[in-house]
Interface confidence: low
């Protein structure tokens, strides 16, 4: 060993005076002369190109060219390689360390607030984490020791820029403006793309990204790449940011972030972002199931391990709150799974954003932008082939859960594409094969990862999936700052935290209700309605008296039909009253002359056959509602396309008489004939099926008015603008929220624990063309249509101005989890 030492370049690199055993040299020219010592390459050359320590490097003489140091003074000089302590000083590495060593919070002096690191690995689909866990020891350790969700839902379209910016603003793409990686804004008359400088124009970027939220509240923020971080949003950049350069090695990115953590307290950021292009790049190139992706996962895992090791070296591994997530997933595409517009149009005289989330607009912009006939394009693309692999939509008709309509950059024609398919202009597009993303955010292949670890997070926990709009509020809570207004629901991720920072409370009711009182059993105005079955005033008086409930009857109906409390009205100045019936309760909106909501509980019926028809052609005035606030039966004669539907289905009756409680004008809502067919099938068949499977369901349903398609209830004047010749406003959508007990041994009204929800928001359209139902029985398309328009309870609340579940005895944060839950039925990945 002594000889070896004498012939070694250890601590002698580039020392021109050194002569080793047999006169070997370690100077810069030794290679040319051929007299280098045996370890010159490993010790002096290779060590300057690596980010790690090894037995050759420990105690090395400091080399200027080194990326990081393993010299004995590197801790003092703060330039050690991330693994110096574990390799050179024998400390346990972060990877080998036991989970349990994390105490409450282990922050060194000067770290009063645990820093937050937001780390994105582009295109890391959730399934990778389970399939390739053994190949990713560092990320898998984070998953084991910290908290993770089964997956995190990306926003639509499941693209890089929209989702990265959603994560840091809590806003939907329609709200923050980055609605795709490529887009046109007619007001700016400019095109945005990832390859043009235009992407750095602040006019594209709305909302308040996390770095600004932190900075506005006295904290510093550093971004090592993040979409938007190089843009002067609201006139400001992050405190520290790096101009995007995809060729910067991951280790260099990590090393720089660790250096930022070494800054003096006054200069040190509290919020950091880190972005890796992988595994997205490899996923595009080879598809999600490929050797390239496996290799990329090992690369990002190694770099992530370097970060954790570097944190441990600084004693920050149990101080920093780190969130590791992705923007979206990845799916395989095929060159034989292409839809070409040339198969649908003789001539392509429009501009198409091609791929998994296509949009179509005028070719000639801005000149033809507003005059472009989007309706005609959708008509020409609807129900054209039996095996069509996309559905065309006008954006206001897209499922409301997507929140993808209210922005001038979102072109009016949208194609919702089947998994693994691409829609393009013509066969000249050969951009296929490999992987892609952008698809429906319910597809399992589009699911992203979410893992978190740190003093604020629970340990060794798996949580239910949630949406990436919720991450911004979570990060604000970690930094103990106030979030800017956003689309997330603050408090809905409190279950991720050991000690929640923000305790939500139920919204306060804005418009108080009254009770529509019963005065006279005979109406002062029959509202042009007829019910031949009620042949005289005595019979009419008898059925109307059924509407005059005693206090005991009111208490009973509330217990059964409003088991979680009356929906609270959060709209301003809404004159509304409660109408109690034995089998349902409704909230009547006087200005709209129709029920705002109706609530009833369908028990588990022994018989699951469809409900019988009700007494035909029987409608009458509700004696509790003044004629001036009621619809008239004559309204429905004026527009032959519109008929009336019932919010509470009269056929769901416990006695033959009780159907008369539902055959009243206050239970009526305007419906297109074609829509009503679907509505009636849902209530007579599917609802009974759900009630049977779930031991009863509570149903709350009602109309929605969202003419300006912004995902929020319309102001009264907005609705008034759209009243046609019928004098009654026509809803743009109808909602149905089904609630049952998660523990199916309990009925909804006696549910002690968690609830199960199934909310739908169905566009109210004059035709059912969305389902291509021609020649098909309802059984083949209605359920699929409802499922396509599944939503969150929160989406219903925003569209109606109602607030649900206020009387459910459960912490508000748990109620918010329920309200932000999106049921999914996807099984294929």
């Amino acid at each position: 060993r002594k000889l070896e030492k004498q012939g070694s370049c250890r601590k002698k690199c580039f020392d021109a005076s050194f002569r080793g055993l047999e006169n070997c040299r370690c100077d810069v020219a030794c290679k040319d002369r051929g007299d280098c010592c045996w370890d010159f390459e490993d010790t002096c050359v290779a060590s300057t190109r690596i980010w790690t320590c090894n037995k050759f490097r420990c105690g090395e003489t400091r080399l200027e060219a080194s990326l990081c140091s393993c010299s004995d003074d590197c801790l003092q000089r703060k330039d050690c390689c991330a693994d110096y302590k574990s390799v050179c000083q024998g400390e346990t590495s972060w990877l080998e360390e036991n989970c349990d060593t994390a105490q409450q919070s282990q922050c060194p002096e000067g770290f009063d607030l645990p820093p937050v690191i937001l780390f994105s690995m582009d295109g890391f689909r959730a399934e990778y984490l389970y399939t390739w866990d053994t190949l990713m020891p560092n990320i898998n350790k984070l998953k084991t020791c910290g908290i993770h969700s089964k997956y995190m839902r990306a926003m639509y379209p499941t693209k890089t820029f929209p989702n990265h910016y959603t994560i840091v603003t809590g806003l939907y793409p329609e709200s923050h403006g980055i609605i795709d990686n490529n887009m046109y804004d007619v007001n700016l008359n400019k095109n945005f793309s990832l390859s043009s400088e235009e992407q750095n124009n602040p006019a594209w970027w709305h909302g308040q990204p996390m770095w600004l939220t932190a900075m506005y509240q006295g904290l510093k923020a550093a971004t090592y790449f993040w979409p938007g971080s190089e843009v002067a949003i609201n006139g400001s950049f992050p405190s520290i940011y790096m101009p995007y350069n995809r060729s910067v090695p991951y280790e260099e990115r990590i090393s720089t972030l660790l250096k930022w953590l070494d800054l003096p307290k006054a200069e040190r950021p509290s919020f950091y972002t880190m972005y890796f292009e992988e595994p997205d790049s490899s996923g595009h190139a080879g598809g999600p199931v490929s050797a390239r992706v496996i290799k990329a996962l090992q690369v990002v895992d190694h770099a992530f391990g370097m970060l954790m090791e570097g944190l441990k070296q600084r004693n920050l591994h149990n101080c920093v709150n780190i969130i590791l997530l992705a923007d979206h997933g990845m799916d395989q595409t095929y060159c034989n799974k292409m839809e070409y517009m040339t198969d649908y149009f003789p001539r392509i005289n429009f501009y198409m954003y091609e791929g998994p989330a296509p949009r179509i607009r005028a070719f000639n912009v801005p000149h033809d932008f507003f005059s472009f006939n989007s309706e005609e394009i959708v008509r020409n693309l609807s129900c054209r082939k039996p095996d069509q692999h996309f559905k065309p939509y006008l954006t206001p008709d897209l499922p409301k859960r997507l929140h993808y309509a209210k922005n001038v950059r979102i072109d009016k024609v949208h194609l919702f594409v089947d998994r693994q398919w691409l829609a393009v202009g013509s066969k000249s597009n050969t951009n296929c094969g490999g992987g892609n993303h952008g698809y429906n955010n319910e597809f399992r292949s589009m699911e992203a990862i979410f893992l978190a670890h740190g003093p604020s997070f629970k340990e060794k926990t798996e949580v239910e999936p949630f949406e990436n709009i919720e991450v911004y509020n979570l990060m604000c809570d970690l930094l103990r700052i106030q979030p800017a207004p956003n689309n997330g629901t603050r408090g809905s991720l409190n279950h991720l935290l050991k000690v929640p920072f923000y305790e939500p409370s139920h919204a306060e009711e804005v418009s108080k209700f009254s009770v529509c009182g019963f005065a006279n059993p005979l109406p002062t105005d029959n509202l042009s309605c007829l019910c031949p079955h009620l042949q005289n005033s005595i019979q009419l008086e008898q059925v109307n008296q059924m509407l005059n409930l005693t206090q005991e009857e009111i208490t009973a109906t509330v217990k059964v039909n409003l088991p979680f409390g009356r929906p609270r009205v959060l709209q301003k100045n809404v004159d509304n009253c409660l109408l109690y019936h034995r089998e349902y309760v409704s909230g009547f909106g006087k200005a709209m002359r129709m029920p705002m909501w109706s609530s009833y509980t369908v028990p588990q019926l022994g018989d699951t056959s469809p409900l019988p028809p009700t007494v035909p052609d029987c409608l009458r005035a509700d004696v509790r509602v003044p004629p001036s606030e009621s619809q008239k039966c004559s309204f429905y004669l004026a527009d032959e396309n519109i008929t009336h539907g019932f919010l509470y289905p009269p056929a769901i009756n416990r006695t033959s008489d009780s159907q008369y409680d539902a055959l009243i004008m206050s239970n009526l809502v305007p419906m297109y004939e074609e829509f009503r067919k679907m509505w009636d099938y849902f209530h007579s068949v599917l609802l009974i099926k759900h009630a049977t499977e779930r031991n009863g369901v509570n149903v709350v349903s009602g109309p929605i008015f969202d003419y300006n398609y912004d995902g929020h209830f319309d102001a009264p004047e907005e609705i008034t603008k759209h009243i046609a010749n019928t004098d009654i406003p026509i809803p743009t959508h109808y909602f149905v929220v089904l609630t049952s007990c998660k523990n199916k041994s309990h009925t909804p009204e006696n549910c002690p624990g968690w609830l199960d929800v199934l909310p739908f928001i169905i566009p109210h359209r004059p035709t059912n063309v969305e389902s291509c139902p021609e020649g098909k029985p309802e059984a083949l398309w209605v359920e699929e249509r409802f499922t396509a328009h599944i939503a969150r309870v929160r989406d219903v609340e925003l569209l109606t101005g109602l607030d649900f579940y206020q009387d459910k005895a459960q912490p508000v944060s748990e109620i918010l989890q329920l309200k932000t839950y999106l049921p999914t039925f996807e099984t294929t990945i």
Epitope: Q217, I481, Q482, A484, P485, S505, K572, N573, A715, P716, E717, E718
Partner: antibody
Framework: EVQLVQSGAEVKKPGESLKISCKGS????????IGWVRQMPGKGLEWMGE????????RYSPSFQGQVTISADKSISTAYLQWSSLKASDTAMYYC????????????WGQGTTVTVSS | DIQMTQSPSSLSASVGDRVTITCRAS??????LAWFQQKPGKAPKSLIY???SLQSGVPSRFSGSGSGTDFTLTISSLQPEDFATYYC?????????FGGGTKVEIK
Amino acid sequence: EVQLVQSGAEVKKPGESLKISCKGSGYRFASNWIGWVRQMPGKGLEWMGEIYPGDSNTRYSPSFQGQVTISADKSISTAYLQWSSLKASDTAMYYCARKDYYYYAMDVWGQGTTVTVSS
Amino acid sequence: DIQMTQSPSSLSASVGDRVTITCRASQGIRTNLAWFQQKPGKAPKSLIYAASSLQSGVPSRFSGSGSGTDFTLTISSLQPEDFATYYCQQYNSYPRTFGGGTKVEIK
């Protein structure tokens, strides 16, 4: 651009009546509450009351209830503050302000109307 | 009625200083608080709503924080145009009430 433009300065004698106005533009006037705020010379701001022009629903501060009347004419996008019998203590600057549609905070203010009551 | 107490009632500061004004509510008002700036002879101008959200067009040197009963308005680096009187106002319950104001003067 959202704007509230108030009527000009008024000089009145005690006991006289007065109606000052606040005209909104650049937004749907009927959809936002309009509030009135008093500022006596050298003093702070006092909330008097507000009106929802859509249905003329009003709310008053107990200190001003019965002293003033708030009204609105949504057809001409104008809100009013009126006195049936002025007192010297009504001498002040009066501001109208729009309440934000979502947050209820006063986001846009009129330029103010000076009312001087002196014999 | 909810009383809003502002402190200090006046302060002297120099350009570039960090200035903090506090506002205390006599009972919890969640984050239903706004801050206004008023210059002599001018109408108040909205700076912050919902305790911490910046009105559009307001410079980022202004920030608000707090919830419940204690609130703060911070000017991170005072500019010449910031010398004015600042008011807080609660809009959690009726009647709406303002703080007494804080006059920021040139030192």
